[in-house]
């Protein structure tokens, strides 16, 4: 209905219009993590905070055991932050040596599941070495970008290090998607 | 509405729909910080440029005094990137001498004030340890989610420290949010 | 419309409601960028996968030849992230010489042509320095913001130094706009 | 208003240091970097040198390492620069000056005369 | 250390006229450039930041323009009062470093 009046009319709109207010979107917040079993060959999954404080889920957008999972097929807007937290690597010690090294990192996936298809698919990938010389280092990694998911997708964050992950106030660590 | 033809009909339609253009936009671009008394105990906030350039405030989106002012209830998308720039901190010469040290740190926070409510509260938060060994660093913080917002709600973008934010161009340091 | 009942009227209505899924959108990823000819004093531009795995355009927005072409005037979000890697910089060896030097640095700019306007404008910048200690660094910068944009703008991607771009995973280096 | 005012002219003997004070009011102290700049008679401005009033960290040009001491005190607003084993060609006008960043000088002192005669 | 210069050294001119500083750094400083005002006896006043951006409370006649190493300030109607010399300064690097001062003497 683009650039037209909108008036009534006998003939019948197909457009799917729909009111902005009753999309799919959730805002999820960081909680401390327990230890738990990770897959092997796969970064372990961030579990969240989806009703307390700021986080929120709303117009079927449900997170449930570490993933959101997307109630209507369409284009969303998928971010998250993560903000990690360590001491110095062994890497600037090696450094010192002279030895040239394989630089420690932080990473974070943003990972799609779909039960029809055997494996996950890395939708977005922040990754950073951290050769940090000071003895306490912190930063974030942020991430956002558009999807077309589909009805039933899963969501979720993986970390390469999850016992570095910064969990101590949730607006350091967070996660949300929002239909477009 | 979803999903549903569209079609003009004796039965009222509740569902707020409303055209996507007259929502409440703002895109705020850095200008330089001049020296001001700041509250004790609370990051600055930075002041912004709001209609010159590539900024712009639309919709009943208004700019007043270091807030965006929310002119409606609703979820918005709120983004800001300070880009930082300084000089090697001592940081770097205490950990020449072999000591643990704590690291200098840039710290970006968007805060949201409630008049109804006694404090701010933060929305999101970037910080970074920063010990640079070259003479002089720059780098961007970037951060971006979704929230809830209240009419009258007001957003200010604090940082650690004012004097290090980069003021020299309006794509390196910005803030805005729009309702989704 | 906003907050009123909506129902069918002999009073015409103007307001350009259309449907979120017909808006103009596109997600596009990283290639192996080939040798080309660079403009004089402007960072090299990336060019991208438009259609492949994650890489999609809908609703007339179009890639061509490094450009996301606008069919549509209105407010768009656009975002960018470029994971950069590299080897040590020689900053660090004339750093342990003692003497101070302008660090090397990693840079995004997202760039607006407008066939009618002379000079390209730089809408978003991310630059860093980099002075990595490590022999071999990888570190992303992101951008994401809301501008105004006009039917027939162009949008690029540009990078101070196309050598050290990531290429080698769709999830790490991408590019994509949205109307809003 | 943001104002900053300088201690009194002076008249130092060869070899002897001097200590200006710089104090500071109108804005937040420890917020924002204070530098030095001084300008012989007749010349071009010469930057000194910072200090960060909130971690005391300083940074000061070569040419006056060691000579050079940039202190404050948070409590009274007021920052300070020493400089020792003073010469003839050290006589100018001292300023202190504040910046909305750490790389430009918005606001400045009044300036100090030092003399440096024997 | 970056060295900069500034030409002319001083220049005559009449109130009313266009008049032109140009500031050179030895290396690139991106826009990190900033223009100062000094009076005889007075400390100097910041008239420009970021090459180009007029601090607030300057004459809208005063205009900077320039990226990496060559810039310049312009004055676009000279006025009584801009009779003064006037110094760039880069910011990009420590030590921060003056141009030598462009005196604007009347003609």
């Known amino acids: 209905l683009k650039g037209q009046e909108f008036a009534p009319s006998h003939q019948q709109v197909y457009a799917p219009l729909r009111a902005d207010g009753d999309k799919p979107r959730a805002h999820l917040t960081v909680v401390r993590q327990t230890p738990t079993q990770h897959f092997k060959n796969q970064f372990p999954a961030l579990h969240w905070e989806h009703e307390l404080g700021l986080a929120f889920t709303k117009n079927r957008m449900n997170y449930t055991n570490k993933f959101l999972l997307i109630p209507e097929s369409g284009d969303y807007f998928i971010y998250s932050q993560v903000t990690f937290r360590g001491m110095t690597s062994e890497c600037s010690e090696i450094r010192q040596a002279g030895r040239p090294n394989k630089p420690d990192s932080i990473t974070v996936v943003i990972t799609k599941v779909t039960d029809s298809y055997p494996e996950p698919t890395q939708l977005l990938m922040g990754t950073k070495s951290v050769c940090e010389v000071g003895s306490n280092w912190f930063q974030p990694i942020y991430l956002g970008a558009m999807f077309s998911l589909q009805e039933g997708d899963k969501l979720m964050v993986n970390v390469s290090d999850i016992s570095l992950v910064d969990y101590t106030k949730e607006d350091k660590t967070f996660f949300g998607a929002f239909l477009l | 509405l979803k999903g549903q033809e569209f079609a003009p009909s004796h039965q009222q339609v509740y569902a707020p729909l409303r055209a996507d253009g007259d929502k409440p936009r703002a895109h705020l671009t850095v200008v330089r910080q001049t020296p001001t008394q700041h509250f004790k105990n609370q990051f600055p906030a930075l002041h912004w440029e709001h209609e010159l350039g590539l900024a712009f405030t639309k919709n009943r989106m208004n700019y007043t005094n270091k807030f965006l002012l929310i002119p409606e209830s609703g979820d918005y998308f709120i983004y800001s990137q300070v880009t930082f720039r300084g000089m090697t901190s001592e940081c770097s010469e205490i950990r020449q001498a072999g000591r643990p040290n704590k690291p200098d740190s840039i710290t970006v926070v968007i805060t949201k004030v409630t008049d109804s409510y006694p404090e701010p509260t933060q929305l999101l938060m970037g910080t970074k340890s920063v010990c640079e060994v070259g003479s002089n660093w720059f780098q961007p913080i970037y951060l971006g989610a979704m929230f809830s917002l209240q009419e009258g709600d007001k957003l200010m973008v604090n940082v650690s420290d004012i004097s290090l934010v980069d003021y020299t161009k309006e794509d390196k340091t910005f803030f805005g949010a729009f309702l989704l | 419309l906003k907050g009123q009942e909506f129902a069918p009227s002999h009073q015409q209505v103007y307001a350009p409601l259309r449907a979120d899924g017909d808006k103009p959108r596109a997600h596009l990823t990283v290639v192996r960028q080939t040798p080309t000819q660079h403009f004089k004093n402007q960072f090299p531009a990336l060019h991208w996968e438009h259609e492949l795995g994650l890489a999609f355009t809908k609703n007339r927005m179009n890639y061509t030849n490094k450009f996301l072409l606008i069919p549509e005037s209105g407010d768009y979000f656009i975002y960018s992230q470029v994971t950069f890697r590299g080897m040590t910089s020689e900053c660090s060896e004339i750093r342990q010489a003692g003497r101070p030097n302008k660090p090397d640095s990693i840079t995004v700019v997202i760039t607006k042509v407008t066939d009618s306007y002379p000079e390209p404008t730089q809408l978003l910048m991310g630059t860093k320095s980099v002075c990595e200690v490590g022999s071999n660094w990888f570190q992303p910068i992101y951008l994401g913001a809301m501008f105004s944009l006009q039917e027939g703008d162009k949008l690029m991607v540009n990078v101070s130094d196309i050598s050290l771009v990531d290429y080698t995973k769709e999830d790490k280096t991408f590019f994509g706009a949205f109307l809003l | 208003q943001v104002q900053l005012v300088q201690s009194g002219a002076e008249v130092k003997k060869p070899g002897a240091s001097v200590k200006v004070s710089c104090k500071a009011s109108g804005y937040t102290f420890t917020g924002y970097y204070m530098h030095w700049v001084r300008q012989a008679p007749g010349q071009g401005l010469e930057w000194m040198g910072w200090?960060?009033?909130?971690?005391?960290?300083?940074n000061s040009a070569q040419k006056f390492q060691g000579r050079v001491t940039m202190t404050r005190d948070t409590s009274i607003s007021t920052a300070y620069m020493e400089l020792s084993r003073l010469r003839s060609d050290d006589t100018a006008v001292y300023y202190c000056?504040?910046?909305?960043?750490?790389?430009?000088?918005?606001?400045w002192g009044q300036g100090t005369m030092v003399t440096v005669s024997s | 250390d970056i060295v900069m210069t500034q030409s002319p050294s001083s220049l005559s001119a009449s109130e009313g006229d266009r008049v032109t500083i140009t500031c050179r750094a030895s290396?690139?400083?991106?826009?990190?450039l900033n223009w100062y005002q000094q009076k005889p006896g007075k400390a100097p006043k910041f008239l420009i930041y970021?090459?180009?951006r007029l601090q607030s409370g300057v004459p809208s006649r005063f205009s900077g323009s320039g990226s990496g190493t060559d810039f310049t300030l312009t004055i676009s109607s000279l006025q009584p009062e801009d009779f003064a010399t006037y110094y760039c300064q880069q910011g990009y690097s420590s030590p921060f470093t003056f141009g030598p001062g462009t005196k604007v003497e009347i003609k």
């Open positions: 000056a504040v910046g909305g960043s750490y790389d430009a000088f918005d606001i």
């Open positions: 200090i960060h009033p909130n971690s005391g960290g300083t």
């Open positions: 970021g090459a180009s």
């Open positions: 290396q690139s400083i991106s826009s990190y």
